[in-house]
Interface confidence: low
Amino acid sequence: EAYKSEIAHRYNDLGEEHFRGLVLVAFSQYLQQCPFEDHVKLAKEVTEFAKACAAEESGANCDKSLHTLFGDKLCTVASLRDKYGDMADCCEKQEPDRNECFLAHKDDNPGFPPLVAPEPDALCAAFQDNEQLFLGKYLYEIARRHPYFYAPELLYYAQQYKGVFAECCQAADKAACLGPKIEALREKVLLSSAKERFKCASLQKFGDRAFKAWSVARLSQRFPKADFAEISKVVTDLTKVHKECCHGDLLECADDRADLAKYMCENQDSISTKLKECCDKPVLEKSQCLAEVERDELPGDLPSLAADFVEDKEVCKNYQEAKDVFLGTFLYEYARRHPEYSVSLLLRLAKEYEATLEKCCATDDPPTCYAKVLDEFKPLVDEPQNLVKTNCELFEKLGEYGFQNALLVRYTKKAPQVSTPTLVEVSRKLGKVGTKCCKKPESERMSCAEDFLSVVLNRLCVLHEKTPVSERVTKCCSESLVNRRPCFSGLEVDETYVPKEFNAETFTFHADLCTLPEAEKQVKKQTALVELLKHKPKATDEQLKTVMGDFGAFVEKCCAAENKEGCFSEEGPKLVAAAQAALV
């Protein structure tokens, strides 16, 4: 259906509150450096304009495309050239090039300081004084730090955030109530951001086909009772939703996501028995609930895969006459039977099956050639299983911090050219896989671990793409989405690396270290560990253990000293000298 005014259509569909929130998010993701007040003003003006168009669709400019309207609005920002440099050149372009230009300037690592919450009393006063402004600030702060955040999901988290304050600001001990709830929400938000960045990277770097394959596997695991037609329909719609959000079309994305939730709820009988509770909720909670819904039980009478994919004499005909449908069916049938496999593994198996058919269907006797194809999957399945087993054992032995350090050493040796902050950030996140997945039952471990690793390694790829320094990282990131993790796992020590010159400044510490929260203290120590390795890449695990132990003792000693700063300036150089001697 064609609408006279696209902006009026979206305003009517989404309602004023969600419309305004999404516009604020869109602007904050594009112009990440602008102050909150400027964005509030822009969002207010766009919302007022949309409201006017909803009342009179043939009003002036109401027929313009959303990209034109939003782009024109962004280009009115006075400080564009000062704050964003060459991003201002985007305004010289016409649509759709102008929007593509804005998208290309999104910064995945804007370097804003971490959000520090003020005192609970001040927070509650701000919340009670102007709830709308308070939640707008939350949307703004998250959106500018995470320019690819899944916008409709951010509206949901803002609603959760509101709920936390509504509850905790009434509590006797506000701090005790707010602390754990805000932290739990923070963890969810960070994971959500990373997951959506992975989806956007899949679409942008590897195309619709890669994203659709990923989604077919995931949804077939979750909804094994749904038939392939139903899975295909949901995947097609879901692809459109994520393409829109990744492309900055947040109003269309949120609207289409709501439509998809509506469709799933209207057709739950042919999708999953687990959707009922979700479908009774309002739109934001409904979509979120559907995205997180538990797996349905497998149908009891699933026949062997071999009948259709190995034993059937028509396999090559089926494959050659409609390759994507046939491979999609294979992926669907395999995934619904294997909820315990990671999506990445399922996609590798489908790729292996495809390669086998490409080879075998060109021979004189295809059935003999592909007869053992399912047996040939074994090494592909064993590899992540063994990896998870080995790493979970290491995690259980070392704990999260120790496991992070082991990964830090491993990854610094693989790619020592990568910047220290990136190596620390990524290794710390990789280390969290232990806490997140190793306590799960055997049947859920691989899926949890490998799919989480894919999301974290995507962060490494995104950061590295901004300033590429390692050919091997570029290779692992760009050759194959499903083989990224095995590619990184397979990297050995980079023998071509020339050690970094020693810089005493890097290993100089001050008394402010003592007052840092535990996590930030760990980051400081881990930064030193990476720098040490870049200086002495041949250091053994034993040597590093000794030096890190000494370093921990040094920090403890100086933080307990009467004259902390004096202790750091006196003992620090001694520690560095001892470390250098130990690592010869």
């Epitope: 449908v325 046939f326 069916t329």
Partner: nanobody, 126 residues
Framework: EVQLLESGGGLVQPGGSLRLSCAAS????????VAWFRQAPGKEREFVAG????????YYADSVKGRFTISRDNSKNTLYLQMNSLRPEDTAVYYC???????????????????WGQGTLVTVSS
Amino acid sequence: EVQLLESGGGLVQPGGSLRLSCAASGRYIDETAVAWFRQAPGKEREFVAGIGGGVDITYYADSVKGRFTISRDNSKNTLYLQMNSLRPEDTAVYYCAARPGRQLITSKVADLYPYWGQGTLVTVSS
């Protein structure tokens, strides 16, 4: 749920023709892999012809290739089997079977089809 209802069977002389129909309800037939099977007295049920779900790719048993044609009319939600040059050995009860899903595979394994019609009798005799 898919309900299937066959019609068009009857008595025909060798060399003659018949057209079987299978009306589907409860699901669009173009999104369903559908097939015709037959069962002669005292014999196993056997695959005759099939057509994929979401793709018009057809399959035939060697014994009927060149004589039988499977097709569907999406607007009428109906599957057809045009049978020409009929032989006495084609005598059997013909069943329509459905396997929902946009899959081009029309398996020849009867057990893989969850939905079946009640059958229509075809007798080829002089």
